[in-house]
């Protein structure tokens, strides 16, 4: 039952992670303009991954997409490489996560399959909020980087005079969003590749019958070896030895007329 | 940088006509919003007409009908045709243009205001 919570829970967090993550990368407010030495600005510029907007002092908004690719930073290159390879992943996992949830049952599936799924899954999701984490860090560090450069070039003009005052940005709603989306995601992964240790069959043991022969002490249980998935903690698959006439589950066998041949 | 000349402001009888042109030069890489205010003497700058890139265009409801704010093609300049005239419509007529005048994938855009052409309507 925990497993199943752990699995089902791990699922809706990295899905409302993933929806983060897509919402975070189609949000144009990724950088926004630093109002702080003028907070009543008849204009207020910001930018996403794939336009830049203006919005003006009588409420009227015009986004422009970037139609250049090679006029683009290298870095704005990489965070959307980033945030897409996110969202493809997370999209998969998704998928996989669907098909490994416990309370679905398709077909004759096995648990060693459906624990593999959602290992694979967990993995994906993991590697998708990562994704989306890094995304996001590496535009909040270009963003603090150009911050400080700005705000090094208003000061130091010609003779040491203000210069026409430059535009400065800082982070922007979609940050915020993307970094608590990617989050979400890795928590979702790790929680679904706990889910999928759980899931593992646990390792049975299979009764046997012993067989006393005349003269020996020791019985041998044909079969009797342990089955494991891999999962348990008997990998070796060692033989059982008995000292005394017993089945599997202890009971104590008699002799009797049929044991001596 | 980016400057805004107007012309056309003149003395003018009631009901007649007038043509204010606004025309922007220097670094642009297009227009947000370009439109005119007015200031009356002892009152506050309030908007006129104003055109948006998407082709919208606004009017203060005291010259709406008499007004018309329309951009030459191709040019970065607007013209406000004003008809049938009145002695209120008298102020100093302002150009305002919020033009993105970056070059970088930024696009920053900035507000620029002209020097104002003087508009007045004898009755």
């Known amino acids: 039952m925990a497993v199943t919570a752990c699995q089902g829970l791990g699922f809706v967090v990295s899905l409302i992670g993933i929806a983060g993550i897509i919402a975070a990368t189609c949000m144009d407010q990724w950088s926004t303009q630093d109002l702080y030495n003028n907070p009543v600005t008849a204009v207020f510029n910001y930018q996403g991954l794939w336009r830049s907007c203006v919005r003006e002092s009588s409420g009227f908004t015009e986004c422009r997409g970037y139609f250049t690719l090679l006029g683009l930073p290298a870095m704005l290159q990489a965070v959307r490489a980033l945030m897409i390879v996110g969202i493809v992943l997370g999209a998969i996992g998704l998928l996989v996560s669907i098909f490994a949830l416990k309370c679905i049952r398709i077909g004759s599936m096995e648990d060693s399959a459906k624990a593999n799924m959602t290992l694979t899954s967990g993995i994906m999701f993991i590697v998708s909020g990562l994704c989306a984490i890094a995304g996001v860090s590496v535009f909040a560090n270009m963003l603090v980087t150009n911050f400080w450069m700005s705000t090094a070039n208003m000061y130091t003009g010609m003779g040491g005079m203000v210069q026409t005052v430059q535009t400065r940005y800082t982070f922007g709603a979609a940050l915020f969003v993307g970094w608590v989306a990617g989050g979400l995601t890795l928590i979702g992964g790790v929680m679904m590749c706990i889910a999928c240790r759980g899931l593992a069959p646990e390792e049975t043991n299979y009764k046997a019958v012993s067989y006393h022969a005349s003269g020996h002490s020791v019985a041998y249980k044909p079969g009797g070896f342990k089955a494991s998935t891999g999962f348990g903690s008997n990998t070796k698959n060692k033989k059982i030895y008995d000292g005394g006439a017993r089945t599997e589950d202890e009971v104590q066998s008699y002799p009797s007329k049929h044991d001596y041949v | 940088a980016v400057q805004l000349v107007e012309s056309g402001g003149d003395l003018v009888q009631a009901g007649g006509s007038l043509r204010l042109s606004c025309a922007a030069s220097g670094s642009i890489f297009g227009f947000v919003v370009m439109g005119w205010y007015r200031q009356a003497p002892g009152n506050q700058r309030e908007l006129v007409a104003m055109l948006t890139s998407s082709g919208t265009t606004n009017y203060a409801d005291s010259v709406k009908g008499r007004f018309t704010l329309f951009r030459e093609n191709n040019k970065n300049t607007v013209h406000l045709q004003m008809n049938s005239l009145k002695p209120e419509d008298t102020g100093v007529y302002y150009c305002?243009?919020?033009?993105?005048?970056?070059?970088?994938?930024?696009?920053?855009?900035?507000?620029?205001w002209g020097q104002g052409t003087h508009v007045t309507v004898s009755s």
């Open positions: 305002r243009a919020v033009i993105r005048s970056d070059s970088s994938w930024r696009a920053d855009a900035n507000e620029y």
